[in-house]
C-alpha cells in the first residue's frame, strides 16, 4: 500500500508568492510559493495519486503583514481552502497568546490540529478541550494512518503560551500515544511536529512504532540529487534514521516559507512496515501557475493590508536616526529603539530566579535602512517601518558563548570607518572600543546585563559562560561576515517578523523618544567619524 505525504512547515505567513529569498515578490515571473501556487501543485498530485495526505508541521503564524493584520484568521481560511488533512502546533502559533490560537485557528480550522506533548491545566483545560488533539486517525483509501503531533518544549521561551499549558518532553509524551494507536490496530504512524531536525531524528530513533517523521522549526532543507534553488541540503531526502529497534525511519522537512512542497512516497507492507520511501521537495517556482480562484481570494483579502500599512501605529517625538552615517559608525537611536523592541518582545517570566531569560540584543547597523522624521506630526506607520527594515527578516533567539560574542564585537569594528554594515547596534550591552589598537583586539570593555538578578546591572562578559542573545536571522546565519556566530552558536530558534516586533513595541509605548545613551563608546581621544 502506497501513501503520498505532501508537507509544509514554517510557512510564516507567506500566503502570497515571494521572491527567491522569501521576501516580497518584485518580479512576478521569478517569484515562488504562495498558497495559490501550492494549491495548483497539491490538486495536481491529488488527481494523479490515490492515497494523499497534506500535512503541516507548524509555524504558519508570524512572518508578514498578513499575520499582523489577520492574526491567524488568514491561516485557517486558506489552509481550509487547500484542504489540509492535519497540522501540528508550532511555537509561533502561541505568539498572540492562547486566545490568539483558540479563536482564529483552533475554532475555525476544518482539519485536526495536533500536539501530544502540550497539556492544558487549570481553567484552560476545559476551554481548550478537544480543540487540539494528541493524535488523529485519518482514513486514507481503504486504510487508516495515525498522526501524532508534537511541539517544541522550548515554546514558553520562544512565544506566549501562558501559564496553563505544560510543554512536556516530546519523546516521553509521544510514546504512550503511539502505543494507543497500536492498540487500535493502527499500524502506519506518522509523527508530525515542530521541534527541529535534531529532535525529529531523536523521535525516529527512540519512539517505538513511529514509521515516518515529518518535522519543522529548524527550516531544514533536505534533497536528493542536484538542488533546484539556492538552499544547500543538510542531507538526503528522506533522511533515514535507524531506530533503536532496528527499523529504517524516514525523516523529512521542507525548508520554510512555502517555497517548497515536501513530497514523500512511502510503501507499506500489509503489517504496516515501511518497505520503501523516496521523494524530494518540489520547488514551487513560476513554472507552476497560481490557481485563479485562490489567487482571486488572496487579492480580496489583500485590500485590508494596504489600508493597514498607512495607519498610525504610534508617535515619535524625536528624530529616529536610522541613517547609515550614524548606524554604521556609532550608537544610533534607531538601533536602540529596535533593540529595545527586540528585548521587550522576548519578555518571558518563566523562572523566579530570572527577571527575564534574555537581556541582550545585537543588530547589524547595515540592516537599518532608513531614518524616520518626527516632523510628520510624529506619525509612525507600518510603511515607515518597512523602509527601515525592508528585508522581511526575523529577530531570533540564539545561545552563544561569551567568547563568540567577543569575536562578534571585534568583527563589528575590524575595518571601522568604511561605512560597512557589520557595525553592531546593541541593547543590554555596554561596549567600549579602542580603534587605535589593531583589528581583532579593539574591544577593551564588554559588559552585559545580568538576567539572574532582581535588579538588572551590567557585569563583565565571561568568556566561558553561555548567553542568550536576540539578533536578526541575518546575523544568526553568518551574514555581514559574522561567520563565528553561525559556526559557534549552541542553539538557534527562529523568532518574530522584524517589522512586527518594532510595530508592536511602538503601539504598546504609544509615544517613543529613544536616546543615544552611551551603550557604545570609543576610548581615549581617538577621533571617530
Amino acid at each position: 500500500w502506497e501513501l503520498t505525504i505532501l508537507h509544509t512547515n514554517d510557512v510564516h505567513s507567506r500566503l502570497e508568492q515571494t521572491s527567491e529569498d522569501s521576501s516580497k515578490c518584485v518580479n512576478a515571473s521569478r517569484c515562488m510559493g504562495g498558497v495559490a501556487r501550492l494549491f495548483t501543485k497539491v490538486q495536481q498530485i491529488r488527481r494523479a495519486e490515490p492515497n494523499v495526505l497534506l500535512l503541516d508541521a507548524g509555524d504558519q503564524y508570524q512572518g508578514t503583514i498578513w499575520f499582523t493584520v489577520y492574526k491567524g484568521a488568514e491561516v485557517a481560511h486558506f489552509m481550509n481552502a487547500l484542504r489540509y488533512d492535519a497540522m501540528a502546533l508550532g511555537n509561533h502559533e502561541f505568539d498572540n497568546g492562547v486566545e490568539g490560537l483558540i479563536e482564529p485557528l483552533l475554532k475555525e480550522a476544518k482539519f485536526p490540529i495536533l500536539s501530544a506533548n502540550i497539556k492544558a491545566k487549570g481553567p484552560l483545560a476545559s476551554q481548550i478541550s478537544g480543540l487540539y488533539l494528541p493524535y488523529k486517525v485519518l482514513p486514507v483509501g481503504d486504510e487508516v494512518v495515525g498522526i501524532v503531533g508534537y511541539t517544541s518544549k522550548e515554546t514558553p521561551f520562544l512565544s506566549n503560551p501562558g501559564t496553563n499549558l505544560v510543554f512536556e518532553d516530546e519523546i516521553t509524551a509521544l510514546q504512550p500515544e503511539v502505543d494507543k494507536l497500536k492498540t487500535l490496530n493502527v499500524n502506519k504512524i506518522i509523527a508530525l511536529g515542530h521541534s527541529g531536525f535534531e529532535m525529529d531524528k531523536l523521535i525516529a530513533q527512540k519512539v517505538r512504532g513511529v514509521d515516518v517523521v515529518v518535522g519543522g522549526h529548524s527550516n531544514t532543507f533536505l534533497y536528493t540529487g542536484n538542488p533546484p534553488s539556492k538552499e544547500v541540503p543538510a542531507g538526503k531526502y528522506p533522511f533515514i534514521v535507524t531506530s533503536d529497534d532496528g527499523r529504517k525511519v524516514p525523516v523529512v522537512q521542507a525548508y520554510a516559507f512555502g517555497k517548497y512542497l515536501g513530497y514523500l512516497k512511502i510503501e507499506f507492507d500489509e503489517r504496516g512496515n515501511v518497505i520503501s520511501s523516496h521523494g524530494n521537495p518540489i520547488l514551487l517556482n513560476s513554472s507552476i501557475p497560481e490557481d485563479p480562484s485562490i489567487k482571486a481570494d488572496i487579492n480580496k483579502w489583500r485590500i485590508k493590508l494596504d489600508n493597514y500599512s498607512t495607519q498610525e501605529l504610534g508617535k515619535t517625538i524625536v528624530y529616529l536616526d536610522g541613517s547609515s552615517q550614524s548606524c554604521r559608525f556609532r550608537e544610533c537611536n534607531m538601533g536602540n529603539l529596535i533593540c529595545d523592541a527586540m528585548i521587550n518582545n522576548n519578555l518571558r517570566h518563566t523562572d523566579e530566579m530570572f527577571w527575564n531569560h534574555v537581556s541582550m540584543c545585537i543588530l547589524n547597523g547595515g540592516g537599518i535602512r532608513s531614518p524616520i522624521d518626527e516632523r510628520n506630526n510624529g506619525t509612525i506607520t507600518w510603511e515607515n517601518l518597512a523602509a527601515v527594515l525592508p528585508f522581511g527578516g526575523t529577530f531570533d533567539l540564539v545561545q552563544l558563548k561569551g567568547s563568540t560574542l567577543k569575536k562578534a564585537f571585534e568583527h563589528s569594528v575590524h575595518r571601522y570607518g568604511q561605512s560597512t554594515g557589520e557595525f553592531l547596534q546593541v541593547g543590554g550591552i555596554h561596549v567600549v572600543y579602542d580603534l587605535s589598537r589593531k583589528p581583532g583586539d579593539r574591544v577593551v570593555k564588554l559588559d552585559v546585563l545580568c538576567t539572574k538578578c532582581r535588579v538588572p546591572s551590567y557585569d563583565p562578559l565571561k568568556m566561558d559562560e553561555v548567553y542568550k542573545v536576540i539578533l536578526p536571522n541575518f546575523l544568526a546565519n553568518g551574514g555581514d561576515g559574522f561567520q563565528m556566530i553561525k559556526d559557534e552558536l549552541l542553539r538557534h530558534d527562529s523568532g518574530d517578523q522584524d517589522i512586527n516586533v518594532v510595530s508592536t513595541y511602538i503601539s504598546k509605548m504609544k509615544v517613543i523618544y529613544p536616546a543615544v545613551e552611551g551603550r557604545i563608546k570609543f576610548s581615549h581621544h581617538h577621533h571617530h567619524h
Partner: antibody, heavy 119, light 107 residues
Framework: QVQLQQSGAEVKKPGASVKVSCKAS????????IYWVRQRPGQGLEWIGW????????KYNEKFKGRATLTADTSASTAYMELSSLTSEDTAVYYC????????????WGQGTLVTVSS | DIQMTQSPSFLSASVGDRVTITCKAS??????VAWYQQKPGKSPKLLIY???TRHTGVPSRFSGSGSGTEFTLTISSLQPEDFATYFC?????????FGQGTKVEIK
C-alpha cells in the same frame, strides 16, 4: 457545547429503506468521526459503522455492509445513515455518536431515532 | 468477532455499596475498552475509556481497570442516580462490540 440532534421516529414497511439524519453543533464537524450504533428493543448495543466527514471515508460492520450507507453534508454539519432492505429485525433505536479521541469510546450521543419496521 | 461477556447480568445493591462489574473479552484487546451507563429511554453515557480514563464530568466514584481480556468497572459507593444498565465495549478490533449489559437494581 457538543450536540447531536437526530431526526424523528420512522415507521417503515419490510423491504423499504430508511434515512436517519444527525445534525452536529458546538464543534467543527469535519474534525471528528461520526459513529452509528443501534439498540434493538430490550437488547444490547450494536456498532454499525463510522464516517469521517473530513474526507467522507467510511467503515462498516460487515454485518451491515451493502445495506447501510453512511454519508455526510459538511455544509449542513449533518451525517446520514441509510439502511435498506428493512426487516422486522431492524426495528431498533438508531444512535449517532462522536468521540473525544478517535475511536476511544463514544463521548457524545444523539437522542436516538426509533425505526419501526412493520407490515 | 470479539465477544464481550459481562457479569453479572443483574445486580441488586443498596445505596453506599461498592459494586464491581466485570467484562471478559474473547481475545486480547489491550486497554481499548470503554464503559457506558444507560438509563431507560435515554442515550448511553460514556463513563470510562482506555480501560481506566474517566470521561470529563464523571464522578470519581467510578473507576475502571484491567487490560488484555479482563476488565472491571467499580462504583466505590453506589448513589441513587447510579441505578442503571452498564455496558462495556471494545474498540481494538473490527467490528467493535459491546457486552450484553449489567442491570444494577435497588435491593
Amino acid at each position: 457545547q457538543v450536540q447531536l440532534q437526530q431526526s424523528g421516529a420512522e415507521v417503515k414497511k419490510p423491504g423499504a429503506s430508511v434515512k436517519v439524519s444527525c445534525k452536529a453543533s458546538g464543534y467543527t464537524f469535519t474534525r471528528y468521526y461520526i459513529y452509528w450504533v443501534r439498540q434493538r428493543p430490550g437488547q444490547g448495543l450494536e456498532w454499525i459503522g463510522w464516517i469521517y466527514p473530513g474526507n467522507f471515508n467510511t467503515k462498516y460492520n460487515e454485518k451491515f455492509k451493502g445495506r447501510a450507507t453512511l454519508t455526510a453534508d459538511t455544509s449542513a454539519s449533518t451525517a446520514y445513515m441509510e439502511l435498506s432492505s428493512l426487516t422486522s429485525e431492524d426495528t431498533a433505536v438508531y444512535y449517532c455518536a462522536r468521540d473525544v479521541y478517535d475511536y476511544a469510546g463514544f463521548a457524545y450521543w444523539g437522542q436516538g431515532t426509533l425505526v419501526t419496521v412493520s407490515s | 468477532d470479539i465477544q464481550m461477556t459481562q457479569s453479572p447480568s443483574f445486580l441488586s445493591a443498596s445505596v453506599g455499596d461498592r459494586v464491581t462489574i466485570t467484562c471478559k473479552a474473547s481475545q486480547g484487546v489491550a486497554t481499548a475498552v470503554a464503559w457506558y451507563q444507560q438509563k431507560p429511554g435515554k442515550s448511553p453515557k460514556l463513563l470510562i475509556y482506555w480501560a481506566s480514563t474517566r470521561h470529563t464530568g464523571v464522578p470519581s466514584r467510578f473507576s475502571g481497570s484491567g487490560s488484555g481480556t479482563e476488565f472491571t468497572l467499580t462504583i466505590s459507593s453506589l448513589q441513587p442516580e447510579d441505578f442503571a444498565t452498564y455496558f462495556c465495549q471494545q474498540y481494538s478490533s473490527y467490528p467493535w462490540t459491546f457486552g450484553q449489559g449489567t442491570k444494577v437494581e435497588i435491593k
